[in-house]
């Protein structure tokens, strides 16, 4: 929102030119050399002011005429020293010099702030020859001035390896204030003071600042730019802007929203990505962050079994990547899961709870009290065991896997048997006599095969030996038993 309140016309006298062809006359110059074509605005400041000595660089020509009279020193005529105008207006200014006709190939170049102006500038040099001298006028025009056109302009002419430099013409482009620093959007703690900064420049100076909060002026009198506003604290969102005023009018900064940090909204869309027997991978969509970055999240897990003690397991994790694998869960169990996240202000409420279940797992323990007998009469090995505790079955038992390895005289052979879940005994036929049979048993669920029991060894003698006693799972700490019957 930019408005220009007023435009001040600053009159500049147009001095009469000293010779024909001055741009204030209607004479047509004999020769016109345009450096660049372009619209030439009507506004014109006279290039000359006769009768004053020049203070810039002066070239004293060494050449004399036929009559051996020394030539006068060469210098640019005085011109207007300072032009003040509004942005987007047109301006034209010039340098003029009278050069004796003995000099050929004189060119005038324009310089701004120490740099030569080349290329598509609207510069025109006009020549007005007379009997002894040629008047040269170099005009420079800008059709629509901008702030970047501010600066010191000079003309330079080279004669006899001497450089003649004009007095500077200062161009001052005035306009509405221009912001160099505007207030920035911020997220702030409730009821906590904070600062906003506003800075604007002219010309013209001074630039005065008014602060506006929710369309009400904070300061009824202006403050010089730059201005820092200390806001004493907010309880709700507010919009701030600053107005910059100078003699040309006012410019209004962008409005910035200042938000109040709050606790986050609860996460939404908690979903199950994957379930295993002992872990559940969940994801969630974070809620609104309350204008303060999330720091971390907390996953709350409670057993959904009505007979459970209702204790809640809490897992803390980083806020990203909105994904967490909950571990150390029981197999084939139901859980309620909720997620809460925190920022610097505090914790969000818990998300809506979701129900999740772990899958069946392979049993986590082996069958207990494994005992092996040799039944010589039927040429079988009888195996007995106790099923693992229900808690550690990690699913519904579908049976058992029995591994029996027969070893004799350097030959080893492993066989596997599957047994239904009902029994807790099995019978396998003797494979080799005069050999050691090593038996291990694992419980099986749909989730897989559990660990095998510790090995139980029994020696199978040659035919005709007597079956004395069973072999059984050793007590903890004992070496592998070998029972020879």
């Amino acid at each position: 929102a930019i408005t220009e309140a007023r435009e001040e016309a600053k009159p500049y006298p147009l001095f009469p030119g000293p010779f024909p062809g001055s741009l204030q006359t209607d004479h047509t110059p004999l020769l016109s050399l345009p450096h660049a074509s372009g619209y030439q605005p009507a506004l014109m400041f006279s290039p000359t002011q006769p009768g004053r000595p020049h203070t810039g660089n002066v070239a004293i020509p060494q050449v004399t005429s036929v009559e051996s009279k020394p030539l006068p020193p060469l210098a640019f005529k005085h011109t207007v020293g300072h032009i003040i105008l509004s942005e987007h207006k047109g301006v034209k200014f010039n340098c003029s010099i009278s050069v004796p006709n003995i000099y050929q190939d004189t060119t005038i170049s324009w310089w701004k702030d120490g740099k030569e102006l080349l290329g598509a500038h609207h510069a025109i040099t006009q020549f007005y020859p007379d009997d002894e001298v040629t008047a040269i006028i170099a005009s420079f025009s800008i059709t629509s001035v901008q702030r970047s056109d501010n600066g010191s302009y000079i003309c330079k002419m080279k004669i006899n390896n001497e450089e003649i430099v004009s007095d500077p013409i200062y161009i001052e482009v005035q306009g509405l204030p221009h912001f160099t620093k505007q207030p920035e959007s911020m997220n702030v703690t409730r009821n906590t003071a904070f600062n906003l900064t506003c800075q604007a420049v002219g010309p013209p100076e001074p630039v005065n600042i008014f602060w506006v909060q929710n369309s009400s002026r904070v300061n009824e009198q202006p403050e010089k730019s730059p201005s820092v506003l200390t806001v004493p604290g907010l309880t709700e969102m507010a919009v701030f802007s600053c107005e910059a005023h100078n003699d040309k009018g006012l410019t209004v900064s962008k409005g910035v929203q200042i938000n109040i940090k709050a606790i986050p909204s609860p996460p939404t869309e908690v979903s199950i990505r994957n379930s295993t027997a002992h872990s559940i991978l969940i994801s969630w969509v974070p809620g609104f962050d309350g204008y303060s970055p999330f720091r971390n999240c907390s996953i709350q897990v409670k057993e959904a079994d009505p007979l459970s003690n209702g204790s809640v397991m809490i897992f803390n994790t980083s806020a990203l990547p909105h994904l967490y694998q909950i571990k150390q869960l029981q197999a084939l169990a139901n859980y309620s899961i909720g997620v809460s996240c925190m920022n610097e202000i505090g914790w969000s409420a818990v998300s809506p709870w979701i129900l999740a279940s772990t899958t069946e797992g392979a049993p986590s323990v082996a069958p207990l009290n494994v005992t092996v007998f040799l039944n010589e009469s039927s040429d079988n090995v009888d195996i007995r065991w106790m099923k693992p505790p229900t808690k550690q079955q990690d699913g519904e038992l579908v049976g058992y896997r029995i591994s029996h390895v027969w070893q004799s005289a350097g030959i080893s052979k492993e066989l596997l048997e599957e047994v239904g879940q009902n029994g807790s005994r099995a019978r396998i036929s003797v494979q080799v006599h005069n050999a050691t049979c090593t038996v291990r048993i694992a419980a099986v669920t749909r989730g897989g095969v559990g660990p095998f029991s510790d090995p139980v060894k029994i020696f199978i003698p040659a035919h005709g030996w007597v079956d004395y006693a069973p072999s059984s799972t050793p007590a903890p700490g004992n070496a592998d038993p070998v029972l020879i019957i």
Epitope: W211, S216, Q221, P232, G233
Partner: antibody, heavy 118, light 106 residues
Framework: QIQLVQSGSELKKPGASVKVSCKAS????????MNWVRQAPGQGLEWMGW????????TYADDFKGRFVFSLDTSVSTAYLQISSLKAEDTAVYFC???????????WGQGTLVTVSS | EIVLTQSPDFQSVTPKEKVTITCRAS?????MHWYQQKPDQSPKPWIY???NLASGVPSRFSGSGSGTDFTLTINSLEAEDAATYFC?????????FGQGTKLEIK
């Protein structure tokens, strides 16, 4: 330190005029606006308006348009309140107070009692 | 214009008691200022912009509120707190004051 010193009590007849002064010191006078606040005997505070000490432009609350005039003499850092055609109900203590950010009246004059009585 | 209504108008309180003065605005305001005035004195700035204590104000005072409801609280009243307290709103012209709450020590 910042001080606002007001002129002394005035006893006036109905129809007369009075001019109350408020001299500021301890800060740049033209940096802060000057408010005028009225307090009738035993009553609350009424904001009368303010004068921009930078531009000299006054702003009057609706109830104080007409007979009340705010003015300045920046050369002596003084604000003035003039009341013309005084009425009995103008009897009150008149305070000047600086106009800070958010219309915070951080500094107050000691008050000037104007009594209008025939 | 925004009308500010303070309650109570008058309160007689024993020392060490907690005191709450409320100021209700007829429509939402951005900030509420509070001033303390003792008899035959000018008002003193007391609480700036809802909750900021002016310099020299004891910490037993506090201010809070937003929108239309604002409060000045004295945690443990002392004899020197006997005075009239005025609220003043910022946010809408004209500036307005509450009618005042007079605190008396029993």
């Amino acid at each position: 330190q910042i001080q606002l010193v007001q002129s002394g009590s005035e006893l006036k007849k109905p129809g007369a005029s009075v001019k109350v002064s408020c001299k500021a010191s301890g800060y740049t006078f033209t940096n802060y606006g000057m408010n005028w606040v009225r307090q009738a005997p035993g009553q609350g505070l009424e904001w009368m308006g303010w004068i921009n000490t930078y531009t000299g432009e006054p702003t009057y609350a609706d109830d104080f348009k007409g007979r009340f005039v705010f003015s300045l003499d920046t050369s002596v850092s003084t604000a003035y309140l003039q009341i013309s055609s005084l009425k009995a109900e103008d009897t009150a203590v008149y305070f000047c107070a600086t106009y800070g950010h958010y219309a915070w009246f951080a500094y107050w004059g000691q008050g000037t009692l104007v009594t209008v009585s025939s | 214009e925004i009308v500010l209504t303070q309650s109570p108008d008058f309160q007689s309180v024993t020392p060490k008691e907690k005191v709450t003065i409320t100021c209700r605005a007829s429509s939402s305001v951005s900030y509420m200022h509070w001033y303390q005035q003792k008899p035959d004195q000018s008002p003193k700035p007391w609480i700036y912009a809802t909750s900021n204590l002016a310099s020299g104000v004891p910490s037993r005072f506090s201010g809070s509120g937003s929108g239309t409801d604002f409060t000045l609280t004295i945690n443990s009243l002392e004899a020197e707190d006997a005075a009239t307290y005025f609220c003043q709103q910022w946010g809408t012209k004209p500036l307005t004051f509450g009618q005042g709450t007079k605190l008396e020590i029993k």
